[in-house]
Structures are given as C-alpha cells and as structure tokens.
C-alpha cells in the first residue's frame, strides 16, 4: 500500500504535488508498512477494541485562515474516555477517584507503556529498532523523553505526508509559500503503540484556507449604543473603530501597516497606521464604511525580464526542477516541470485586506446627568427608609425607560435594581424618585434607554440618619 | 461568473512573434492558475503551459520551451501568451483556459484566438 | 511524458443508443483523467473530471469509469445534440496530455 491508499479517499495527482510543494514534507505515493501500522477502514470491527475502555476522538483544529507565504499551526489533541489521563510518563491512566460505566478500577494503569518499552528487546543498545520507525521506514528521532512519546500522527494534506512522534497534544507548522490558494484539506491518522507493532485509534480532517488578502475584522465600540453587534449606532457620539489582523504566525510583524478608512458620509478618505479610529457620524441614515489594509510583507519576486532573443530558439534560462516518482528516479529529462526562476526570499509585496459594513445611524439618547437630589420628608414616626428624588436631564432623543442601580459605595455588589417606563417631554426632564434603606454611603447608577441606546450616570450619595438636621449628600458625581 | 475574453484573430508571417492576451473576470484572478492549450485547424488540443498569476511561476511544455512566453497583469486580470519564431505549423486556435484549485482540469475556457502563420 | 491513446476515432450511433469511447493511458494517472466535448467552433467544454464525477450541469446520460490505465467516457443514450468530438486529457501530471480526440456522429 502507498500512503494516499491509506490517508486519503482519493489519490493526489503529481500535479498537486508539485504545486504545493511543502518543506520538510513527503509525497504519499511513498509504500506504507502495513505490517507494524495495519490499515482499517472505515466500519472495521476492530475499532472497536481499538483502545481500552471506549474511542478516543482526535480534535484536529488550525489557526486558519494563513496569509499566502506565513505559516498554518495545526492542533491535535486527544480526547480519552472518561476517567483516562496521560500521566508525566506518557503513560495512561485511570484518574483517581472518578467512577466510570465499569466502576473505579483496581488497576492505575490503562496502558503501562513505560513497563513495555524497559522490558523490550532486540534494541543493540542504542534504542534503535525495527519497530521504532514511521509508517514510510523512517527510525523515531531519538531526543530526550523519546520513550515517553507513544502516539504516532501522520500529517496529509495536498499529496504529501508528515509523521511525527508525540503525546496526547501535537502541533505542526506548515509554511504555505509553496500553497495554492483556497480551501484544502488535512487530515490526521493517529496510532498508539502497541507491543512491537501501532494500531490505530483517531482519524481526523479539517478544511484549512490559504489567502492572498489579509484577513481583516473590525471590532466597533460606541458610548451608549444599547447593542454593539447590530451595526446601529447614534448620531453625534463617536464610534470606536478597531482593526484586528488575523496574523498568528507575526507574518507581518516587521511590516508596516497602513489603514485607509472610507466612512461613506462624504467626509473622504482617512489614511493611518494606527489600528485604531475615531469617527463621528452627524447624519442619520444608512452608511458604507469600507476598510483596506495594505502591508509590505515577504513576497514572491517578480521575473526577470526575458532574455534578448537569439537568432535560433536555445534552451531557456529557467531553472529546471526534475519531477521524479519518489520512488522510480526516471532517466534526465523525464518530466521536467520548468518553474521561471527560484524565488528570492528578499522581494517585499503589497498584501491587503478589506473590510465592508454597512452602519445605521439612527437618533440616540448622547448623555444623562443627575442635576438635584431632594430627600422627600416622610410623616412621623420616621421609617427605617429614605425617599430620594433625583432630577435628571438628557440630550438627544426621548427616553422611554429608566432604570436605577442601588450598589454599595464601591458600585460592585448590587442591592436592588429597579426599571420603570417613563413619559418625558422634549425638554427631557425627569423626576425618579428612589427607596434607600437605613442611611449610609450607596452607588447610584442611573440609566436612561430607549431601543437604541442607553446612557449612564453614576453618583455617590451619603444618606444620613434620620435627624432632620443631616442634610443630603451627593459625594461625588 | 467566470469569463475568460481572449484578443481577437492575429496573421503573422513566419519568423514573427504573436501575443495573445486572456482576461480574466468573475473570480479572485491570483487564485488559479492559467493554462494555454491550442488546437490547428481538424487537429486535437495540444497543452501549452501555465502561468500562476499571483506568483508567475511558469511551466511550459518541452516542446515550446524557449519559444514560449507568459506572463501577467494583476492591475488588469489579463494572462498573455507571446508565441516567437513562428512557422506555417503555428497556426492554430489558441484557448486559455482557468484550472480549478490544485487540479488540472478546465471548467472555463476562452473563446479562442485563431493565429494564422502564411507568408 | 504519458501518452494516450483514444478510441475510436470515430463513432456513428443511433439515437438513444448507448456511445462508448475508450481512453489508454502509457502509465497510471488514476483518478486523474477529465473528458471533454467540444462542437464546431466552440472551445471545449468539461464532462467529467477524476475519471467519474460528472461537472455541475452535466445531463446524467454522461457517465465516467475507469482506474490506472483504462478510462471510459459512456453516453448511455445518444441524443442529436451530442453530437461532437470528445477528448480525454490526463490531469495527473505536467505535461498535461489530451487523447486525439473521438467523433461521434448519428447512424
């Protein structure tokens, strides 16, 4: 069997191959040994004993979407039945105390791998065996902790495979220079060790995207805008624009980035290379806001010129790149593919990005303030509580709701809440009349809403004790 | 939708150079390559080569490498194909078409150009 | 290179009868191979690609088969419009190859 017979549904072309060439990668029409790595398909009863205690699931995960020419990070993790752990050793065991379908189990060990590998034999001192190597032959490299490491991932995506040794969590990095743009496809087989031979236990895939545009979002913060995912914003109050890059590999870490902002209300073009911006809008109504990115960034070269012609056709100045079989060198000149020139890892290229959102500005209530307080003079004998009226005014548009806040002085632990439908002119104007139970220092935070909007304000009061003589206190405002 | 719009019908005398240009809309134009395939006149299709706009990685059949050159303009989505040193065996319909992905097989094509080679 | 071989050269079939065009190719290109119809003066248009799987907006009567060197193109019932020359071309490696091409026509 070849790898592609055993990791994918369908062979890749040579062409795909050579296309996307990744380095440090090989082609999957290399043999796969089926005697140390059996291959089941899908369906196969032995899955089902395939690991003790239930099915492991393989989490395969990237941090896709990768601008054309950085790296693509892919994520395996191993999720085990229930009560099962990776112990320091690499090791799996049973976790203590917790009970599962077969109950608490005598036995610590699920899979004592450690016992295994200091019994095995036929290992001429160095560790090295005929059982110690990859599906394609290739011998386990022998770091520090190797024999702690008993799963085995082989990699696949776009004709070409990657194996590597590892424990229940796995990261690989892949360069995407050589990556053809769009969609592709990874996936993942996992094998555990078992005696002198693997069987395996997870099989995982995952669509990844490879780009030429810098992936762009735009996170967009407004005081008083009552729900910032609906894209509605107020007028006359000023809306936070942020620019965040999708750049998990610091692809363009040395490159500068420039932000050309169009806000579609006629104000122009704003130019800048801060990620974050101001804009105010003073119209109502439906507006286009659109973003480019631009940044210099590591880039393919652009070829030379073509040579003056000569009177008769010779060969090209190309390089020749031969594209043998892996396994079958051909003679010289069989298949060559002919790429224009090696590219020169110096040359910088513009890369942008694009952002486009359509905003609604509507009318919004723009700011509250809590201009008198009046303690409200109840009959005697006097109550255990306080009457406070707050005379409050707004700007903008017309509340519809108030509601009040009552926290203790440090405004974090909330006593009592209470939201009331208000009535008010255009003069916004408003009397809220509030209970305060027995005297002390209390945060009040007051708000005004309507659907679109909601403004804040917030005060410290002083409610005294029930001496006629203790004024009101606002504490501060 | 994808549309490839190649140049119009060119007469060229032996030993001359033709250039024909592809331009391409409907689809992010650096994402796919762009391959050349001709066809003289009651023949089969014959592969040229191909061009990676984003890139302008080249591969060019054995048989017109050195006579053969394609190049790009990303400003204008256009491929071009400069065919030199022409012979009477030249003529031909002339087809860009887009492959899909990392597949080499062509859902779109142009219209073609005929390119005739007489003295 | 890979060399194909197609064949016939040349098809006559009755309507609504089954056509069948044969595909060799001089090594294992699977499931690499595309077919092509192409009519007069018009530039070829795609059937089938990876051997089997019929393009968006294929009438159903096309149909692909094959593996390693032998591919077949079948157009289960014939009908007027299918009229053409068909190629298959191997998508498997560079150089891209097309096979010579079969006509089919009305008996």
């Known amino acids: 069997k070849r790898f592609h017979d055993v990791l994918g549904n369908e062979r890749p072309s040579a062409y795909m191959r050579e296309h996307n060439q990744l380095n440090g990668w090989s082609s999957d029409e290399n043999d796969w040994n089926e005697k140390l790595y059996p291959v089941w398909k899908r369906g196969d009863m032995r899955w089902k004993n395939s690991w003790k205690g239930g099915r492991v699931q393989a989490v395969l995960t990237s941090d896709s979407p990768a601008l054309v020419g950085s790296n693509i990070t892919f994520a395996v993790n191993l999720i085990f039945p229930r009560c099962q752990k990776e112990d320091a050793n690499g090791n799996i065991v049973y976790e203590k105390n917790c009970r599962n379908e077969a109950g608490l189990s005598a036995d610590p060990y699920v899979y004592n791998w450690t016992a295994w590998s200091e019994d095995s034999d036929g290992e001429n001192g160095t560790g090295q065996s005929h059982h110690n190597v990859f599906p394609d032959g290739k011998p386990f490299p022998h770091h520090p902790g190797w024999r702690r490491w008993n799963f085995i991932y082989v990699f696949h995506t776009l004709g070409q495979y990657f194996q590597k040794l590892g424990r229940c969590s796995v990261r690989v990095s892949v360069n995407t220079a050589n990556v053809t743009l769009g969609p592709q496809l990874m996936e993942v087989t996992v094998y555990r060790r078992h005696g002198r031979a693997y069987v395996p236990i997870a099989q995982v895939k995952d669509v990844y995207v490879v780009t030429d545009q810098i992936p762009v979002f735009v996170t967009m913060f407004q005081k008083n805008d009552r729900n910032s995912s609906d894209e509605t914003f107020l007028k006359d109050l000023p809306i936070m624009f942020d620019v965040l890059i999708h750049d998990p590999s610091h692809f363009l870490n040395y490159s500068t980035i420039n932000y050309k902002w169009s806000f579609g209300d006629n104000t122009g073009l704003f130019v800048s290379t801060n990620h974050t911006v101001n804009h105010t809008y003073v119209l109502n109504g439906t507006f286009s806001l659109n973003l480019t990115v631009k940044a210099a960034a590591p880039g393919p070269c652009p070829p030379p010129p073509p040579p003056p012609r000569p009177s008769k056709p010779t060969p090209s100045l190309a390089t020749t790149l031969k594209s043998y079989d892996s396994n079958t060198p051909g003679p010289a000149g069989d298949n060559p593919l002919e790429l224009s020139r090696i590219p020169d890892e110096n040359c910088q290229i513009n890369r942008y990005g694009h952002f486009q959102a359509t905003i609604t500005i509507v009318e919004g209530i723009l700011e509250v303030n809590i201009i008198q307080m009046t303690d409200v003079l109840m009959p005697v004998p006097w109550p255990e509580s306080s009457l406070i009226d707050f005379v409050v005014t707004c700007q903008g548009s017309i509340p519809t709701e108030v509601c009040t806040i009552i926290s203790d002085p440090t405004c974090e632990i909330t006593q009592n809440t209470v939201c009331s439908p208000v009535d008010v002119d255009e003069m916004c104007l408003l009397t809220v009349r509030r209970t305060f139970n027995g005297s002390g220092t209390y945060c009040v935070n007051l708000t005004l809403g309507d659907d679109t909007s909601l403004a804040l304000t917030s005060t410290l009061i002083s409610v005294p004790d029930r001496d006629p003589a203790s004024p009101l206190r606002m504490a501060n405002s | 939708q994808v549309q490839l719009v190649q140049s119009g019908a060119e007469v060229k005398k032996p030993g001359a150079s033709v250039k024909v240009s592809c331009k391409a809309s409907?689809?992010?134009?650096?994402?796919?390559?762009m391959h050349w395939v001709r066809q003289a006149p009651g023949q089969g299709l014959e592969w040229m080569g191909e061009?990676?706009?984003?890139?302008?990685?080249?591969n060019y059949a054995q048989k017109f490498q050195g006579r053969v050159t394609m190049t790009v303009d990303k400003s204008t989505s256009t491929v071009y194909m400069e065919l030199s040193s022409l012979r009477s065996e030249d003529t031909a319909v002339y087809y860009c078409?887009?492959?899909?992905?990392?597949?080499?097989?062509?859902?779109?094509w142009g219209q073609g150009t005929l390119v005739t080679v007489s003295s | 290179d890979i060399v194909m071989t197609q064949s016939p050269d040349s098809l006559a079939v009755s309507l609504g009868e089954r056509a069948t065009i044969n595909c060799k190719t001089s090594q294992d290109v699977s499931p690499s191979l595309a077919w092509y119809q192409q009519k007069p003066g018009q530039p070829p248009k795609l059937l089938i690609y990876?051997?089997?799987k019929r393009y968006t907006g294929v009438p159903d009567r096309f149909s692909g088969s094959g593996s390693g060197t032998d591919f077949t193109l079948t157009i289960s019932s014939l009908q007027a419009e299918d009229v053409a020359v068909y190629y298959c071309?191997?998508?498997?490696?560079?150089?891209?190859?097309f096979g010579g091409g079969t006509k089919v026509e009305i008996k």
């Open positions: 078409a887009r492959s899909t992905g990392n597949y080499a097989w062509f859902a779109y």
């Open positions: 071309q191997q998508h498997y490696s560079i150089p891209l190859q």
């Open positions: 409907g689809y992010t134009f650096t994402s796919y390559w």
């Open positions: 990876s051997a089997s």
């Open positions: 061009i990676n706009p984003y890139d302008q990685r080249t």
